[in-house]
Each structure stands twice: as structure tokens, then as C-alpha cells.
């Protein structure tokens, strides 16, 4: 069919979830089956992710939105948008290329992924250690003998564990 | 083919409302959406709602939340009840089906006579 052009862009009304149709003289055509478009104006949809073997879907695709996968259990995500998904290892263990190992003597990991910490160092801050670390629990921070009074109790549990990769807030 | 027929045009006041049908028959089996667009004189033909066979349906925003796109599939007829009229939605509107996707277009693309909407006081 012959129509007039409009001096804007034709393709500037296709909303999200249409594409401007380059086979149908511009016109906005819905995206094909297992495609999205989640802005308007686009000249094609993208194809829709999908979550296979060691993923598994957390949302569909739609016409509008990618689909966005997790990971099977036994296993976390690691990147934007869950890109890899990595074995889970029991607390007291890490990671390495070999598989899981438990963490060395002096060091300790309290979730399913992440690295081994080195348990805190009580007597950098002039304490004791209160209760003994362990593969899977930091060390307990206590009072130095001097800094019992009568009747005062001053127990510092250490700061609480960071994941790898985050700043503190 | 596919032959699509419209119906339910007219004249209305502006905030009336309009039921436009689209029966459609033929080779019904392989259309992956339904699809109204509207041409007002002398400019573009522009989407107005779509509804693929799974359901799923996508409105352009001037229409968002005053025109609903559904269809019935025992008697091959898609609607698209339109609410709160204005002056602006005065166009021919066509009814518009798409074939499955080939991977570089869709496979067939037929359309209505069209019906004219007037909104108008």
C-alpha cells in the first residue's frame, strides 16, 4: 500500500515488543516467537536468552523482556545478569581448578562460594582470642587481660565477612 | 490465504466507545498474530495493538489503557474494544495477520478492507 510519509522517523512510534518492519515498508510488525524488543523505536527484536543445562529459567521472555535465568541447585551465579553459573562448595571449603578444598589452617569460609579468609588477627587490636576459629567460623575477639575490669564484659565479634568483589558501603 | 473481514466502524462522540471486530477465515491454523493498525488522511499506517496466538499483546501508547485488543477463538474473531474516544482516533482501521516466522520475515501478511472510526461532537 502506498502512504505518505510523516517528516519523523516512522519507526520513532513502534512501541516495545514491535520492531520497524524494513519487509512491510516500515510499518511496526510484533517481534517473531522467542523474541523481544524492550524499547520502542527498534528496527529489529533481539533474540531471547535461554536458560539451558546448568541455568534455569527465573523468567520467561516475553515480548518486551529477555528471559533471565539462575542457576540449577548445587551451583550459584557469578556475573551481570547471572553469565556463568559456579559450583557451590560446603562452608570450611573453596573453590580451585581441582574442585572443592578445604580451607587451609588459619583460614575459614562461611558460605557455599567464595575464597578462604584468613581468620582476624585479635592481637592487631591489642585483644585475645576469645573463641577459636575454625574452617567454617572466623575467630572470637575478647578483651585483653587488662582491659577487664570487675563486672565488665567486652566482647568484639570481628567484622562480619565480605563476599569477594564487594566494596564495603 | 487468509481473508479478513471488519466490522463496527461509525460515527461516535468523543469519550464514546467503539467494538471493532475482525473475522477472519481461510487458512487460520498458521497465523502467529493479529494485528490493528489505523491510517488517518494523509499519514502512516500506525500500529495500534496486537495479539499473537499465545495470547500475548502489545499496545501502542497513545492507546495504552483506553483500547483493549482480545480475540475468540471458536468463532476466529479478534476485537479491539476502544474506550474514552478522541478526535485523534478518527483513522481507518485495518485488521492485519501474520504468518509464522521464517527467520527473516513472517511467511504471509494479509489485511482488511479496513473500517472508518469517526470520533466527532
Known amino acids: 500500500f502506498e502512504r505518505t510519509r510523516s517528516l519523523q522517523d516512522p519507526c520513532s512510534n513502534c512501541p516495545a515488543g514491535t520492531f520497524c518492519d524494513n519487509n512491510r515498508n516500515q510499518i511496526c510488525s510484533p517481534c517473531p516467537p522467542n523474541s523481544f524488543s524492550s524499547a520502542g523505536g527498534q528496527r529489529t527484536c533481539d533474540i531471547c536468552r535461554q536458560c539451558k543445562g546448568v541455568f534455569r529459567t527465573r523468567k520467561e521472555c516475553s515480548s518486551t523482556s529477555n528471559a533471565e535465568c539462575d542457576c540449577t541447585p548445587g551451583f550459584h551465579c557469578l556475573g551481570a545478569g547471572c553469565s556463568m553459573c559456579e559450583q557451590d562448595c560446603k562452608q570450611g571449603q573453596e573453590l580451585t581448578k581441582k574442585g572443592c578444598k578445604d580451607c587451609c589452617f588459619g583460614t575459614f569460609n562461611d558460605q557455599k562460594r567464595g575464597i578462604c579468609r584468613p581468620w582476624t588477627n585479635c592481637s592487631l587490636d591489642g585483644k585475645s582470642v576469645l573463641v577459636n576459629g575454625t574452617k567454617e567460623r572466623d575467630v572470637v575477639c575478647g578483651p585483653s587481660p587488662a582491659d577487664l575490669s570487675p563486672g565488665a564484659s567486652s566482647v568484639t565479634p570481628p567484622a562480619p565477612a565480605r563476599e569477594p568483589g564487594h566494596s564495603p558501603q | 490465504a487468509v481473508q479478513l473481514v471488519e466490522s463496527g466502524g461509525g460515527l461516535v462522540q468523543p469519550g464514546g466507545s467503539l467494538r471493532l471486530s475482525c473475522a477472519a477465515s481461510g487458512s487460520i491454523f498458521s497465523i502467529y498474530a493479529m494485528v490493528w493498525y489505523r491510517q488517518a488522511p494523509g499519514k502512516q499506517r500506525d500500529f495500534v495493538a496486537s495479539?499473537?496466538?499465545?495470547?500475548?499483546?502489545i499496545y501502542a501508547d497513545s492507546v495504552k489503557g483506553r483500547f483493549t485488543i482480545s480475540r475468540d477463538n471458536a468463532k476466529n474473531t479478534t476485537y479491539l474494544q476502544m474506550n474514552s474516544l478522541k478526535p485523534e482516533d478518527t483513522a481507518v482501521y485495518y485488521c492485519n495477520s501474520l504468518g509464522s516466522w521464517d527467520g527473516e520475515r513472517y511467511e504471509y501478511d494479509y489485511w482488511g478492507q479496513g473500517t472508518q472510526v469517526t470520533v466527532s461532537s
Open positions: 495479539i499473537t496466538s499465545g495470547g500475548s499483546t
